[in-house]
């Protein structure tokens, strides 16, 4: 017998469905209605036929009582080709739910998203994560999606984007967004970062993650942040091949005084890069290629410095910097 596509745990907390049949029995997902955390993977199926079965224009208020009874707080939908109209229909219905975190991964969104009707209510998400989602509408996708969300979004993560730059003039501000993660967009680069960080649309950002995004120098990132008026408290530039030296012709960039934590681990650095902020609470330089202990004048004023996993560090040697958090044990880098 073929295994059931969905599995609900004994606590009714987590439910995972993997639909791999060409014509899946979607009713199997019903058992997930009592779960808090739901994952549905559609095996790469085209969900276009669903449009014939559902009335995407129906008033979602007719489902309000049922949807309010759902316990789902975290929903992941993956591996499907989804008509924009169907996505919108789902968002309209889910607006009546208690859903807080939505993850979309490995999706191809086809067609354009209609505008939000006047009487419609947006989805009150706190977290939206997108990974490898392509949109037929190109650069305007974020603005189109944003209109279906209430303005309280706190966490936005966009990985493996086909169009990581946004149509900034169409995007409204994200007043509550404190964490923006653009990691795993290796083609982004510093110019792309400037295009993605729409000026003054992200006024509340505290945490900015740019792992594996094709960044080249901390100074270049500083310039992009300054241009956008983004002042994070914490910045993650790990897993980028960073150059330690700054282009002499490039203007010097003043880091925001708000920045207190900088992650430069796994960045291939052979020396401490120039142009770092003058003062930091946390600086992570672990798993680089530093062949000697950094001199005090090369480093910012820093409370917690991590240098683990660099070649110069042999277990048992003296800690290279006051206030360091090094364990003396070389981690797996």
């Amino acid at each position: 017998t073929t295994p059931e596509p969905c599995e609900l745990d004994d606590e009714d907390f987590r439910c995972v469905c993997n639909f791999s049949e060409p014509q899946p029995d979607w009713s199997e997902a019903f058992q997930c209605v009592s779960a808090v955390e739901v994952e549905i993977h559609a095996g790469g199926l085209n969900l276009e036929p669903f449009l014939k079965r559902v009335d995407a224009d129906a008033d979602p208020r007719q489902y309000a009582d049922t949807v309010k009874a759902l316990r789902v707080r975290r929903l992941t939908v993956g591996a499907a080709q989804v008509p924009a109209q169907l996505l919108v229909g789902a968002l309209r219905v889910l607006a009546y739910s208690r859903l807080k975190e939505l993850t979309l991964e490995d999706l191809k969104i086809t067609g354009t998203m209609p505008p939000l009707p006047l009487e419609a209510t947006g989805l009150a998400l706190s977290s939206l994560r997108l990974r490898n989602v392509s949109w037929a509408t190109g650069r305007s996708w974020l603005a189109e999606l944003q209109q279906w969300l209430k303005p309280g979004l706190k966490v936005l993560s966009i990985a493996q984007a086909h169009s990581p730059a946004f149509s900034c003039e169409q995007v409204r501000a994200f007043p509550a967004l404190t964490s923006l993660d653009l990691s795993d967009n290796p083609g982004l680069g510093e110019r792309g970062l400037m295009a993605a960080l729409c000026p003054h649309k992200f006024p509340a950002i505290q945490n900015l993650a740019l792992r594996n995004t094709g960044m080249e120098t901390p100074t270049g990132v500083c310039a992009a942040l300054a241009a956008a008026g983004v002042q994070p408290h914490s910045l993650d530039l790990s897993h980028n091949s960073l150059r330690a030296t700054v282009n002499p012709s490039a203007p010097r960039c003043m880091w925001s005084s708000a920045l207190n934590s900088l992650n430069l681990s796994f960045a291939g650095l052979e020396q401490v890069p120039k142009g770092l902020p003058a003062k930091l609470r946390v600086l992570d330089l672990s798993c680089n290629r530093l062949n000697r202990a950094p001199q005090p004048d090369e480093l910012p004023e820093v409370d917690n410095l991590t240098l683990d996993g660099n070649p110069f560090l042999v277990p048992g040697t003296a800690l290279p910097h006051e206030g360091s958090m090094n364990s003396g044990v070389v981690p797996a880098c």
Epitope: C6, E7, L8, D9
Partner: nanobody, 115 residues
Framework: QVQLQESGGGLVQAGGSLRLSCAAS????????MGWYRQPPGKEREMVAQ???????NYGDSVKGRFTISRGNARNTVYLQMNNLKPEDTAVYYC?????????WGQGTQVTVSS
């Protein structure tokens, strides 16, 4: 191991009613989603009705408005009230309990609707 026992099937005239019952016994530590499925002669098994642990229901298109699924007071008992029965409702009706690791199915009860 969980056992499911269906009852209430039988022969009924078109337009008539039947009430199926299903009782679950064995190692069940929480209220689980349950459902009724049917297999008409020579056809695939299909979903008839489902009920979640919190009482949310779902019905197959062909039975909407005629069949009602409900839970009993006992922890994992489920009923299927079938009204306005049609000859095409003739099938073996199975009860199902959604359970982590391996779902449990009953042996089935025959429902025959004569015209």
């Amino acid at each position: 191991q969980v056992q499911l026992q269906e009852s209430g099937g039988g022969l009924v005239q078109a337009g008539g009613s039947l009430r199926l019952s299903c009782a679950a016994s064995g190692r069940i530590f929480s209220i689980r989603p349950m459902g009724w499925y049917r297999q008409p002669p020579g056809k695939e098994r299909e979903m008839v009705a489902q009920i979640s642990s919190s009482g949310i229901t779902n019905y197959g298109d062909s039975v909407k408005g005629r069949f009602t699924i409900s839970r009993g007071n006992a922890r994992n008992t489920v009923y299927l009230q079938m009204n306005n029965l049609k000859p095409e409702d003739t099938a073996v009706y199975y009860c199902r309990l959604f359970k982590t690791g391996a779902d449990s199915w009953g042996q089935g009860t025959q429902v025959t609707v004569s015209s």
